[in-house]
């Protein structure tokens, strides 16, 4: 799934070289991109007699007229003059149409069309502009994730896009959290998906000339509950010098709320284990996963007494997991000496 939005201008549609005045109806919020002449030697664009700068929201650049998002004040007469002469290559009037970002998705898409519209380039049925962005057809997504479906398209007149779920008009009104329809991105975004979001999502792209559709298949996976998972190799066996500070790290993964304890194995009456077979331990730190830095055990200014076995114990409503590591503390005067520590223990 694509993580980021990106501005996507309409494909550059080259107006014909007919010099009679032509009209083009543009929906509010719609990006405009028109060509005039060849890219490098393209003509200069003028609006109401003033030449458009190569930068800004409305710009004339390399023969292109580009409007990032059409506003009412952008309506008017636009001329494209050939470089180095006063030859009119393009003479058109942009007229304000209905808003593309209207929240009323029940509108008949045909209502965006002006039957008297005289377009400056041939009519064209909708087509996919970036089919490679639509190749991922089957989506299996863990519950809680965000899903984004895109159907970038173009055509003339500019097509409208509608979304269906399992063949029915889909506006997201019955969906907790709703949906985001980004018409300029031809996208549908659903945050925090749940099992009821499963199904077939169809984008239906239409204009006066024709229509195209594409299906995305969405499955929402519910993770089966499990006891906490501890990252392999953590906590790690550590060797430190007397007086130094030590950090032991434990990485815990758990869907259900986990509870974490740091334990130090101790010896009582010369024995490490009680009559019940469980080791003697001292609880050093206890908290839930939301506590800051609960997954790190800090040992300050360690002494020889701090040497030994440490265990990270994590539990949730399903069960317990633990992993252990050994801390070896070296005397300051002989830092080259190392003791062989047992391997860290891992649960199954």
């Amino acid at each position: 799934l694509e993580a980021s939005e990106e501005v996507e201008l309409e494909p550059c549609l080259a107006p014909s070289l007919e010099q009679q005045e032509q009209e083009l109806t543009v929906a509010l919020g719609q990006p405009v991109r028109l060509c005039c002449g060849r890219a490098e030697r393209g003509g200069h664009w003028y609006k109401e007699g003033s030449r458009l700068a190569p930068a800004g929201r409305v710009r004339g650049w390399r023969g292109r007229l580009e409007i990032a998002s059409f506003l009412p004040e952008d309506a008017g007469r636009y001329l494209c003059l050939a470089r180095g002469s006063m030859i009119v290559l393009q003479n058109l009037t942009l007229i304000t149409g209905d808003s593309l970002t209207s929240s009323n998705d029940d509108e008949d898409p045909k209502s965006h069309r002006d039957p008297s519209n005289r377009h400056s380039y041939p009519q064209q049925a909708p087509y996919w502009t970036h089919p490679q962005r639509m190749e991922k057809k089957l989506h299996a997504v863990p519950a809680g994730n965000t899903v984004k479906f895109r159907c970038p398209a173009a055509g003339n007149p500019t097509p409208t896009i509608r979304w269906l779920k399992d063949g029915q008009a889909f506006h997201g009104e019955n969906r907790i959290g709703g949906i985001r329809l980004r018409h300029q991105h031809w996208s549908l975004v659903m945050e925090s998906v749940v099992p009821s979001d499963r199904g077939t999502y169809t984008c239906l792209v239409e204009n006066a000339v024709g229509s195209i559709r594409y299906n995305y298949l969405l499955d929402v996976l519910e993770r089966s509950p499990h006891r906490p998972i501890l990252q392999a190799g953590l906590p790690a066996n550590t060797t430190a010098v007397v007086g130094s500070d030590v950090e032991l790290l434990c990485k815990v993964y758990s869907d259900a709320q986990p509870h974490i304890q740091w334990l130090k194995h101790i010896v009582i009456n010369g024995s490490s284990f009680g009559a019940d077979g469980f080791p003697y331990v001292q609880v050093l730190k206890t908290a839930d996963i939301n506590s800051s830095e609960v997954e790190v055990l800090y040992l300050r200014n360690v002494s020889a007494e701090d040497a030994g076995e440490y265990t990270c114990l994590a539990g949730n409503s399903i069960g317990l997991s633990y992993q252990s590591a050994w801390l070896t503390v070296l005397p300051e005067e002989d830092p080259t000496w190392t003791a062989a520590a047992p391997e860290a223990r891992y649960t199954d």
């Epitope: 639509m134 089957l138 499963r198 199904g199 594409y214 299906n215 298949l217 929402v220 996976l221």
Partner: antibody, heavy 118, light 112 residues
Framework: EVQLLESGGGLVQPGGSLRLSCAAS????????MSWVRQAPGKGLEWVSA????????YYADSVKGRFTISRDNSKNTLYLQMNSLRAEDTAVYYC???????????WGQGTLVTVSS | QSVLTQPPSASGTPGQRVTISCSGS????????VHWYQQLPGTAPKLLIY???RRPSGVPDRFSGSKSGTSASLAISGLRSEDEADYYC?????????????FGGGTKLTVL
């Protein structure tokens, strides 16, 4: 290694029923869309049905809609195809296959033969 | 009658290059990627090309795929006797009745 093993095929009379099974191993079964594809003797491949990993969404070819039901038991890593009101034209080798994210049938079983005849 | 159209047969001599076509419509090949399968005699189909032109690991680079508009093709260069098999194209179809998978009728390739 992905393994798919179909079973349950056999001879059945027109109008009868049969249930095919596909035992899967070597991958996280519940994460994958699965499908059934059939091939009549001496003919080409025909898609029959597909199901999402959770089992929440099912898809059918028009030729079997209303007669066949696809299902799965993720706890048993098994895919099923319940075939009712069988017709002679349903005679085929039935393959189960994994469906990859981008649409292709990635892995196929060896197939099980279903013969519908009186 | 298959939704995707393939020639029923194709042939070539060892070392030759052979191309198999597959034509469809805007609702299938026009909107979706094309996948190719090879079925050797008496065996289950095997994925040969996916997403128009990608080869799964283990498939020799003698096999290549392409797509343009509503048509696709599979090319086999340096033909070998072991390439004699049935070849099928397939794609999802986004028809009005909902998503389904469509196959070509298959092309029987004979290595002369």
């Amino acid at each position: 290694e992905v393994q798919l093993l179909e079973s349950g095929g056999g001879l059945v009379q027109p109008g009868g029923s049969l249930r095919l099974s596909c035992a899967a191993s070597g991958f996280t079964f519940s994460d994958y869309y699965m499908s059934w594809v059939r091939q009549a003797p001496g003919k080409g491949l025909e898609w029959v049905s597909a199901i999402s990993g959770s089992g929440g969404s099912t898809y059918y070819a028009d030729s079997v809609k209303g007669r066949f039901t696809i299902s799965r038991d993720n706890s048993k890593n098994t895919l099923y195809l319940q075939m009712n009101s069988l017709r002679a034209e349903d005679t085929a080798v039935y393959y189960c296959a994994t469906l990859a994210t981008y649409g292709p049938f990635d892995d196929w079983g060896q197939g099980t033969l279903v013969t519908v005849s009186s | 009658q298959s939704v995707l159209t393939q020639p029923p047969s194709a042939s070539g001599t060892p070392g030759q290059r052979v191309t198999i076509s597959c034509s469809g419509s805007s609702s299938n090949i026009g909107s979706n990627t094309v996948h190719w399968y090879q079925q050797l005699p008496g065996t289950a189909p095997k994925l040969l090309i996916y997403r128009n032109n990608r080869r799964p690991s283990g498939v020799p680079d003698r096999f290549s795929g392409s797509k343009s508009g509503t048509s696709a093709s599979l090319a086999i260069s340096g033909l070998r006797s072991e390439d004699e098999a049935d070849y099928y194209c397939a794609a999802w179809d986004d028809s009005l009745s909902g998503p389904n998978v469509v196959f070509g009728g298959g092309t029987k390739l004979t290595v002369l």
